[in-house]
């Protein structure tokens, strides 16, 4: 006890009245209003509370203090007077702050700010949207996958920023009176082949695919080497020119240099430059065979192996070529003899008649063309008198019928050595190559060095072996007449031909050998 | 053994001719092309023709054709150049060379040395 | 006609050294139908290299060719004394044939 009457036990908060009694301080309450223990508390009043006799006015926030409180303006507001507290809503000059005016630039882009009592908002420009994790930001709106589908199937949408257009996919273009762009774009699958929008390489053929278009190899070409077939950027080679290579186990440097240049002639092969190449090949072959150099010096069967290989090769190039030629006749001379003459036609129905220095063809036109086949029909015959020394001694099968009939009648028949080769090979080919058989013969009239007396004049053709070489034949072909320096042949079937002149004396009328002619 | 034998050194006075040799041995004289080649003194080497036997084709520079005539004798495995209305500026040495159409010059002649002088 | 263009004209290269000549031709030559020959003082030219990169028999492997279109070029990995001569490319595309004026190597 205080000696001047005052308490000095009085709680926290509190003030004493005499020496036996406390008062909690303003803004203080206790559960009596006279504090008589020291038990007693003085706890803080919040005036802020719902039932409190407070009143701070509108746009505005009471803030409980210890053993007070403060009026404050609520966020968006501001007060006029500059007071950053008041105590009542007399005082209260609270109102409502323009953000978007502080603030130009709250709702960052594509947005505009739109002032609200207390606040603002973002209001999104056209084809934006507020991000749901900011609503402040203003993000593109996709319209091609917010699953509208705002454009027809025949388009293809593209979002841009607050936008989209609906384009036409690569290969399509806009119906009649349509535009490009708009969500009403309508549009139409582009034909690149017959607008000749198309980068096909003149060596494959266009086909038109809904919204693009491929390359094709044309029929008889491949792919070269690693393009692969139906792509825009796909390149052909003819199929003519891959097969026609040296042949195996053959070793010669003058025959791999021939090919060689057969392979770049087939590499830089053009459909539009078949004269050409025709050209180029048999003046090729003409200089092969002007000077065969170390092909002479491959034993005899490695020669006629070269000679069949390159028979074979020659026709199937030439008529994989000769499809590309306009209508009309062909004659073509080189220097070390090699001819060649050459009728394409659209199919017409009488014979054909090719005539050469030593050799003139007849037949008929309607053998030429494979029913079906769309392409003009082609006839063509090769003379080829530099084969005749690669051909040096090779053998002659004859049918085995023939053969047995010579043996009973003739022993030791053909055994003095090999027929000798009296005219210029020629090769005969056509569009078909179908020629092992032909609805009507074919004749063959040759001029050819003079026949020693009574030795046997044979028409003969070049048979390709199994082996890949070949021998001298007559199957399917007779010898219709013969004089001292001219033969008339007639084949059943096409291929390279020849009249050779046998080892054997001939008896007058000799049955036997009427078989063999 | 491939050999390609030329005849010797050659005197001859301008406007007049001379033929030039090349015999061949060692190889199918038919078989390959026989080309002459020109070379004078401290200069390069200048391509004049071929003649391949087996057909008697030939083949000429133009810058040479008035000047060279080729010509080949199967029976003897011989090539020859004939050179006419020579002048000072033939005098040079003359090879002959074997090859083909699709082969190099691999074999070459020892070359005839011509000179015209008057 | 064809052009053949050799360069350099001469040049001079130390035993050991690698050098390279070139030759271009005034319109383009398939490789098969290009060749090098080596020209010794007083000598008959010899086939040296073949095909534009084939070496010919008895030729060091120290030499190589290469090239495509009009230009093609002869090199020698490490020269030696032996190596100096003259190297005359040539093509027979097509008539005339024709040969380059040369490259003369001259060892130190």
């Known amino acids: 006890q205080d000696s001047r009457g005052c308490a000095r036990w009085c709680p926290q908060d509190s003030s004493c009245v005499n020496a036996t009694a406390c008062r909690c301080n303003p803004g203080f309450s206790s559960f009596s209003e006279i504090i008589t223990t020291p038990m007693e508390t003085c706890d803080d009043i919040n005036e802020c509370a719902t039932l409190s006799k407070v009143s701070c006015g509108k746009f505005s926030d009471c803030w409980n203090t210890e053993g007070s409180y403060d009026c404050v303006c609520s966020p968006g507001y501001e007060p006029v007077s500059g007071a950053k507290t008041f105590k009542n809503e007399s005082e209260n000059t609270c109102q409502d702050v323009d953000e978007c005016q502080q603030n130009p630039r709250l709702c960052k882009s594509y947005g505009t700010c739109v002032n609200t009592l207390g606040s603002y908002t973002c209001q999104c420009l056209p084809g934006f949207k507020l991000k749901p994790e900011d609503p402040k930001l203003c993000t593109d709106v996709n319209e091609c996958t917010s699953g509208q589908n705002p454009c027809h199937s025949s388009t293809h949408c593209l979002n841009n920023v607050g936008s989209y257009q609906c384009r036409c996919r690569p290969g399509w273009q806009p119906i009649p009176g349509s535009p490009n762009g708009p969500n009403n774009t309508v549009c139409e699958d582009v034909d690149e082949c017959s607008s000749g929008q198309h980068q096909c390489d003149s060596s494959t053929v266009c086909f038109n695919t809904v919204g693009s278009y491929s390359c094709r190899c044309r029929p008889g070409w491949k792919p070269r080497h690693g393009i692969p077939n139906n792509q825009k950027d796909t390149v052909c080679e003819d199929m003519t020119f891959s097969t026609w290579t040296p042949p195996p186990g053959v070793h010669s440097q003058t025959l791999s240099r021939f090919f060689d240049k057969v392979q770049d002639l087939g590499r830089d092969y053009k459909p539009g430059l078949a004269n050409n190449t025709i050209q180029s090949i048999l003046q090729a072959l003409d200089e092969l065979l002007e000077a065969p150099g170390d092909l002479e010096t491959l034993p005899r069967l490695q020669q006629h192996c070269v000679a069949s290989h390159l028979l074979d090769g020659l026709e199937d190039v030439l008529r994989g070529l000769s499809k590309n030629l306009s209508n009309g006749l062909l004659n073509f001379s080189y220097p070390a003899g090699t001819e060649l003459s050459l009728e394409v036609q659209k199919q017409v129905d009488r014979s054909v008649t090719l005539r050469q220095n030593q050799a003139v063809m007849q037949l008929d036109w309607n053998q030429a063309q494979k029913s079906g086949d769309p392409g003009p029909s082609v006839v063509g015959l090769v003379s080829i008198p530099g084969m005749g020394k690669l051909l040096a001694e090779a053998p002659l099968v004859l049918e085995p019928e023939k053969q047995m009939l010579l043996h009973e009648t003739h022993q030791g028949l053909l055994q003095d050595g090999s027929p000798i080769l009296l005219s210029d090979v020629i090769s005969a080919f056509l569009s078909n190559n179908d020629t092992q058989n032909l609805s009507s013969p074919v004749t063959f009239t040759f001029s050819h060095r003079s026949v020693i007396p009574r030795q046997k004049v044979l028409c003969v053709f070049w048979e390709h072996g199994q082996n890949g070489c070949g021998h001298w034949a007559t199957t399917g072909c007779s010898t219709i007449g013969t004089r001292d320096t001219s033969t008339i042949c007639r084949c059943t079937h096409l291929s390279s031909f020849a009249v050779l002149m046998a080892h054997y004396d001939v008896q007058e009328e000799d049955p036997v050998l009427t078989v063999i002619t | 053994l491939v050999q390609l034998q030329q005849s010797g050194v050659e005197l001859a006075r301008p406007g007049a001719s001379v033929k030039l040799s090349c015999k061949a041995s060692?190889?199918?004289?038919?078989?390959?092309?026989i080309s002459w080649v020109k070379q004078r003194t401290g200069q390069g080497l200048e391509w004049i023709g071929n003649i391949y036997p087996r057909t008697g084709n030939t083949y000429y520079n133009e810058k040479f054709k008035d000047k060279a005539t080729l010509t080949a004798d199967k029976s003897s495995n011989t090539a020859y150049m004939e050179l006419r209305s020579l002048t000072s500026e033939d005098s040079a040495v003359y090879f002959c060379?074997?090859?083909?159409?699709?082969?190099?010059?691999?074999?070459w002649g020892q070359g005839t040395t011509l000179t015209v002088s008057s | 006609e064809n052009v053949l263009t050799q360069s350099p004209a001469i040049m001079s290269a130390s035993p050991g050294e690698k050098v390279t000549m070139t030759c271009r031709a005034s319109?383009?030559?398939?490789?098969?139908?290009l060749h090098w020959y080596q020209q010794k003082s007083g000598a008959s030219p010899k086939l040296w290299i073949y095909s534009t990169s084939n070496l010919a028999s008895g030729v060091p492997a120290r030499f190589s060719g290469s090239g495509s279109g009009a230009s093609c070029s002869l090199t020698i990995s490490s020269v030696e004394a032996e190596d100096a001569a003259t190297y005359y490319c040539h093509q027979y595309s097509g008539y005339p044939w024709t040969f380059g004026g040369g490259t003369k190597l001259e060892i130190k």
């Open positions: 060379a074997r090859g083909t159409h699709y082969d190099p010059l691999d074999y």
């Open positions: 319109s383009s030559v398939s490789s098969s139908d």
């Open positions: 060692g190889y199918i004289f038919t078989s390959y092309g």
